[in-house]
């Protein structure tokens, strides 16, 4: 079948990195600079992706594969093949439509992306708070109050000022 196909279509013999040049009796020509073909039998080469501005080159374009981009520091990739770059925030913040905002009381974010999440409620597991939560860190739950030896104390969490939730926008 391969032989039959190549007799019928001389372009099928053109390997990746080349294209079947109709202007030159269908001979296989190398892809021009800044273009590529990732499969054989192509009649054209595709233009290489250019990583500009907030996008930076993660992998250079070759004659057989497209360039790959990622985002410059301060941004993170979104979408297939890093089609978009979204702003990072600091730990203890979340990105809102108006920019980076601090996590409100009772919530935390330990990453540069994502949303502020409520602190763990230790009492739901019958445990006590060993280390208080912050904007950047979740609470650390310790043994249940009953497990504590006499005289030992645990850090009691401050009463929440309001329901944990998203920062006001």
């Amino acid at each position: 079948f391969e032989r039959t196909r190549s007799l019928q279509d001389p372009c099928s013999n053109c390997p990746a990195g080349t294209f079947c040049d109709n202007n030159r009796n269908q001979i296989c020509s190398p892809c021009p600079p800044n273009s590529f073909s990732s499969a054989g039998g192509q009649r054209t080469c595709d233009i290489c992706r250019q990583c500009k501005g907030v996008f930076r080159t993660r992998k250079e374009c070759s004659s057989t594969s497209n360039a790959e981009c990622d985002c410059t520091p301060g941004f993170h990739c979104l979408g297939a093949g890093c089609s978009m770059c979204e702003q990072d925030c600091k730990q203890g913040q979340e990105l809102t439509k108006k920019g980076c905002k601090d996590c409100c009381f009772g919530t935390f974010n330990d990453q540069k992306r994502g949303i502020c999440r409520p602190w763990t409620n230790c009492s739901l597991d019958g445990k006590s708070v060993l280390v208080n939560g912050t904007k950047e860190r979740d609470v650390v739950c310790g043994p249940s109050p009953a497990d504590l030896s006499p005289g030992a104390s645990s850090v009691t969490p401050p009463a929440p000022a309001r329901e944990p939730g998203h920062s006001p926008q």
Epitope: L78, L95, R113, I115
Partner: nanobody, 119 residues
């Protein structure tokens, strides 16, 4: 699955107008706040506008306030962005998004439509 397909982009002269559309499927469109975001060449994502589920509350970035109007047709599961008095700095790929910021939720955005404002 969730699909958002933008259309209506193109090349327009400064001062001109365009109307972008976003056809949504795979989720109950009428329950969600919807947003338009954009990415200008070499820049990061910028939130442009959003509209609540019922269509009676809208919000805009300062850079487009008074020029752009967001609307929706829940019966057609379609989001719109009417862009008037366009400026060269509005040149960008415009994305329709089910929620914003995009990286904080599930990956619910479209493939984008290119808007180029040039004389």
């Amino acid at each position: 699955q969730v699909q958002l397909v933008e259309s209506g982009g193109g090349l327009v002269h400064p001062g001109g107008s365009l109307r972008l559309s976003c056809a949504a499927s795979g989720f109950i469109f009428s329950l969600y706040t919807m947003s338009w975001v954009r990415q200008a060449p070499g820049k990061g994502l910028e939130w442009v506008s959003d509209i609540n589920s019922g269509g009676d509350s809208t919000d805009y970035a300062d850079s487009v306030k008074g020029r752009f109007t967001i609307s929706r047709d829940n019966a057609k599961s379609t989001l719109y962005l009417q862009m008037n008095s366009l400026k060269p700095e509005d040149t960008a790929v415009y994305y329709c998004a089910k929620d914003y910021p995009l990286g904080q939720r599930e990956d619910y955005w479209g493939q984008g439509t290119q808007v180029t404002v040039s004389s």
